[in-house]
């Protein structure tokens, strides 16, 4: 999906109002210094690409993030503010339903969400103005 078509300011607002709080809730009890940020992004559409990948693509040791509250709100924000995003995700969602596993918060998941927090912070930094 080409994230350059998204309404970045609306997604930023969604992040600041709810997604950020849900990420903090997920990470509660974890020290902010516990994990090093190893995933970076160059600009807003790149940040969204990495955020989508880390949030919705199951990885070794962490297969359950897509069902978390922050993930569902991320999906909703992208569906609303990125034209055509929902259509591109239909097949991916169907494939994910088949792979779904029991919801477990592992250390790997905590590390992954810590990376997500860093990507979201980076997303919020640029002042990319829409003309």
């Amino acid at each position: 999906y080409d994230f350059t078509n998204c309404d970045f300011e609306k997604i930023k607002a969604a992040y600041l109002s709810t997604i950020s709080k849900d990420l903090i809730t997920y990470m509660s009890g974890t020290k902010s210094t516990e994990f090093n940020n190893t995933v970076s992004c160059s600009n807003r559409p790149h940040c969204l690409t990495e955020i989508q990948s880390l949030t919705f693509n199951p990885t070794a040791g962490c297969a359950s993030l897509a069902k978390e509250m922050f993930a569902m709100k991320t999906k909703a924000a992208l569906a609303i503010w990125c034209p055509g995003y929902s259509e591109t995700q239909i097949n991916a969602t169907q494939a994910m339903k088949k792979r779904r596993k029991r919801k477990v918060t592992t250390n790997k998941c905590l590390e992954q969400v810590s990376q997500l927090q860093g990507l979201w912070r980076r997303f919020n930094r640029p002042l990319l103005k829409q003309q």
Epitope: N5, S42, N43, H46, T49
Partner: antibody, heavy 122, light 107 residues
Framework: EVQLVESGGGLVQPGGSLRLSCAAS????????MHWVRQAPGKGLEWVSY????????YYADTVKGRFTISRDNAKNSLYLQMNSLRAEDTAVYYC???????????????WGQGTLVTVSS | EIVLTQSPATLSLSPGERATLSCKAS??????VAWYQQKPGQSPRLLIY???YRYTGVPARFSGSGSGTDFTLTISSLEPEDFAVYYC?????????FGQGTKLEIK
């Protein structure tokens, strides 16, 4: 093979208007953002404008904001730059360039046309 | 607007030598810096993006590095065809500014 061919350049008087076109081929035009970049004679590169693949997001350099309008027609594989209220300092070769369009390539220009010369003079 | 300052303005070296070109940004743009090569009468050519990623088909002698506000393009051993003007560009935030360029000339 990716090809970008600019046209529409020429001599115009200060305060006049010009419309540049860029014909794209060799790739799925509707999937890529596009840029206009200019280069004054003997000078460096200056980014002018960007339009996303679906025209949802458009950005301009401060020097052209309010005077230039970027647009695209995905059905015609064409990019445009409408230039109004032209000034002598707008004299340059205008390049159309394709955006890298993925992950670390966003807002990077990976393919360039040969350029079209715009001269603003009385 | 993010300002990119390139140095030196001109670099005079001989084939076989190592070239180091600098690009400094007015604020943190890491890692969103690209490098382009332009030869007289030709369009620019993408070399490096996201500070250190070599673009398809670019020879291995070209490498990019840096973070924060300081970025470097290195050409390990100059070939005759490398003498040209080099521009850095930030692809972090609109307006997507270029540096003023470094001219790499034969000594």
């Amino acid at each position: 093979e990716v090809q970008l061919v600019e046209s529409g350049g020429g001599l115009v008087q200060p305060g006049g208007s010009l419309r540049l076109s860029c014909a794209a081929s060799g790739f799925t035009f509707s999937s890529f953002g596009m840029h206009w970049v200019r280069q004054a004679p003997g000078k460096g590169l200056e980014w002018v404008s960007y339009i996303s693949s679906g025209s949802s997001n458009i950005y301009y350099a401060d020097t052209v904001k309010g005077r230039f309008t970027i647009s695209r027609d995905n059905a015609k594989n064409s990019l445009y730059l409408q230039m109004n209220s032209l000034r002598a300092e707008d004299t340059a070769v205008y390049y159309c360039a394709r955006d890298g369009g993925s992950r670390r390539h966003y807002y990077v220009m990976d393919y360039w046309g040969q350029g079209t010369l715009v001269t603003v003079s009385s | 607007e993010i300002v990119l300052t390139q140095s030196p303005a001109t670099l005079s070296l001989s084939p076989g030598e190592r070239a180091t070109l600098s690009c400094k940004a007015s604020q943190d743009v890491s890692p969103a810096v690209a490098w382009y090569q332009q030869k007289p009468g030709q369009s620019p050519r993408l070399l490096i993006y996201s500070a250190s990623y070599r673009y398809t088909g670019v020879p291995a002698r070209f490498s990019g590095s840096g973070s924060g506000t300081d970025f470097t393009l290195t050409i390990s051993s100059l070939e005759p065809e490398d003498f040209a003007v080099y521009y850095c560009q930030q692809h972090y935030s609109s307006p997507f500014t270029f540096g003023q360029g470094t001219k790499l000339e034969i000594k």
